[in-house]
Amino acid sequence: CKAMHVAQPAVVLASSRGIASFVCEYASPGKATEVRVTVLRQADSQVTEVCAATYMMGNELTFLDDSICTGTSSGNQVNLTIQGLRAMDTGLYICKVELMYPPPYYLGIGNGTQIYVIDPEPCPDSDF
């Protein structure tokens, strides 16, 4: 069967510092040496790219310097962390995996992780 299944958690709650982490795992139908992982955000019918990284199997996952994402890879599993999240960023975050090399190319798209972000309450002023 020429299919690549991608699994990710259904729901994640971001920390009070606006950081959310989740695992994206894929069942590879081929022996890929180069893999691309993209995080997409779907809000209503709009889809935007949050971040993307290409990595060689066995090497570390490297996002661009200005990316809000960081991650590590281990086999067919990618641990993703998204930083700087605010309440308005609450939404469905979809993990997309592409086996880029060698051919054939394979595409796998997860069902998405609903990330909930709650802005922290400002600390009340203290009188001493």
């Epitope: 993307a52 290409t54 054939p104």
Partner: antibody, heavy 118, light 106 residues
Amino acid sequence: QVQLVESGGGVVQPGRSLRLSCEASGFTFSSYGMNWVRQAPGKGLEWVAVIWYDGRNKHYTDSVKGRFTISRDNSKNTLYLQMNSLRAEDTAVYYCARAHYFGAFDIWGQGTMVTVSS
Amino acid sequence: EIVLTQSPGTLSLSPGERATLSCRASQSVSYLAWYQQKPGQAPRLLIYGASSRATGIPDRFSGSGSGTDFTLTISRLEPEDFAVYYCQQYGSSPWTFGQGTKVEIK
């Protein structure tokens, strides 16, 4: 608005070469895989080639391997198809098409006609 | 290579009728799209992921199916729906299209 505009088609003799261009506008070109799809007169659609993101990874249909080369210039938002050793069976309308984030081809150019004839 | 076979080759229907188009794959397909093409025009994406409507596509178009059997349904044909429809698999290379189904006015 988001659009793709092809150019470079024409009439060429068998064995000769032609280069097609596809200029993209209205979106972040480097974030998408780009494809060439062709349609022979009165026939169906045939995928020809794809090039990914930074241009390092490319795939071709078997019938054009070794003859056609897909490339892109992200600084110019332009996709290319260099066609060498052209054959009569390469006669078709050539479309460039963007692969949506979810993989399907959501934006297509208007097409450019390539006729290979002596 | 995954071979997609569409049926019927031609569908003769009247406006207002329901159209059911089939696409069968030679092996299991993970991602399938449907396109509409009118004479002299580029194809237009209708459905992706077997059942998700593309932006701006009317809800009379719906897709269903999984594995090797997929269906495009047009609930009530409008005059502008008479065209050729193609299915495509895009889960693995090489990307392949079906041979097309022509929906014509009866």
